[in-house]
């Protein structure tokens, strides 16, 4: 899977999208990295 | 709203530094990359690195490395861009641009720094 | 480095038009594509990420497609302000990369 930061920031907006925001706050492409998906 | 200004155009001489900054407002900064892109006269699109504002951690393109250094200053909300040993070549429209998810989810660019290489 | 070709380079075109704009890459980048119009003088203005997703306030007339090693972007009906140039990014392998851009003149 792609692991740059864009790819992970528009994972993880997909994800919070899904979820209707419902994560934890620290929970944003600079603190989780490719892993967390 | 989400905004990014950068600092004004700048005139250096060959072999001197340069020092670009980009001012962040309408998001938390330390939540989203920052990139920065070169743009020369009538050229296309270059990506020279980004930056992680939380831990300051970065990527460069090999083309600029060990010539330029990302950096951020978390209290103001600034990222910069310092490129040195600069050659006519340098010459060109700096840009830096970040995808924030909350509040909006979009890709936003600064308006660009003209830095003009020139002895 | 991945090499993203556009084609054309040029095209000239007219209000109302159907256009299409493609991008290919040198490697598999996945759906790693964005796409963006920039207009002279002026930054960068993000169209399409994912090779297919508008981003909010883009114009249902832009549409994008693709996987793999080629994409395109479709504009369904040039309005005035869409003659400008068309870049395609991948973001799929460091260091990014962009296309050399498409130019759209009015005829």
């Known amino acids: 899977a792609c692991d740059t930061a864009t790819c992970v920031t528009h994972r993880l907006a997909g994800l919070l999208s899904r979820s209707g925001g419902v994560v934890k706050n620290n929970f944003v492409p600079t603190n989780v990295g490719s892993k967390a998906f | 709203q989400v905004q990014l200004v950068q600092s004004g155009a700048e005139v250096v001489k060959p072999g001197a530094s340069v020092k670009v900054s980009c001012k962040a407002s309408?998001?938390?900064?330390?939540?989203?990359?920052m990139n920065w892109v070169k743009q020369a006269p009538g050229q296309g699109l270059e990506w020279i690195g980004d930056?992680?504002?939380?831990?300051?951690?970065?990527h460069y393109n090999q083309k600029f490395k060990g010539r330029v250094t990302l950096t951020v200053d978390t209290s103001i909300s600034t990222a910069y861009m310092e490129l040195s040993r600069l050659r006519s070549d340098d010459t060109a429209v700096y840009y830096c641009?970040?995808?924030?998810?909350?509040?909006?989810?979009?890709?936003?660019w600064g308006q660009g720094t003209l830095v003009t290489v020139s002895s | 480095d991945i090499q993203l070709t556009q084609s054309p380079s040029f095209l000239s075109t007219s209000v109302g038009d159907r256009v299409t704009i493609t991008c290919k890459a040198s490697?598999?980048?996945?759906?790693?594509v964005a796409w963006y119009r920039q207009k002279p003088g002026k930054s960068p203005k993000a169209l399409i990420y994912?090779?297919?997703y508008r981003y909010s306030g883009v114009p249902s007339r832009f549409s994008g497609s693709g996987s793999g090693t080629e994409f395109t972007l479709t504009i369904s009906s040039l309005q005035p302000e869409d003659f400008a140039t068309y870049i395609c990014?991948?973001?799929?392998?460091?260091?990014?990369?962009f296309g050399q851009g498409t130019k759209l003149e009015i005829k």
């Open positions: 994912s090779a297919s």
């Open positions: 930056v992680n504002p939380n831990n300051g951690g970065t």
């Open positions: 641009a970040s995808i924030t998810i909350v509040p909006v989810y979009f890709d936003f």
């Open positions: 309408g998001y938390t900064f330390t939540d989203y990359y």
């Open positions: 490697q598999n980048v996945g759906p790693n």
């Open positions: 990014q991948q973001y799929n392998y460091y260091p990014y990369t």
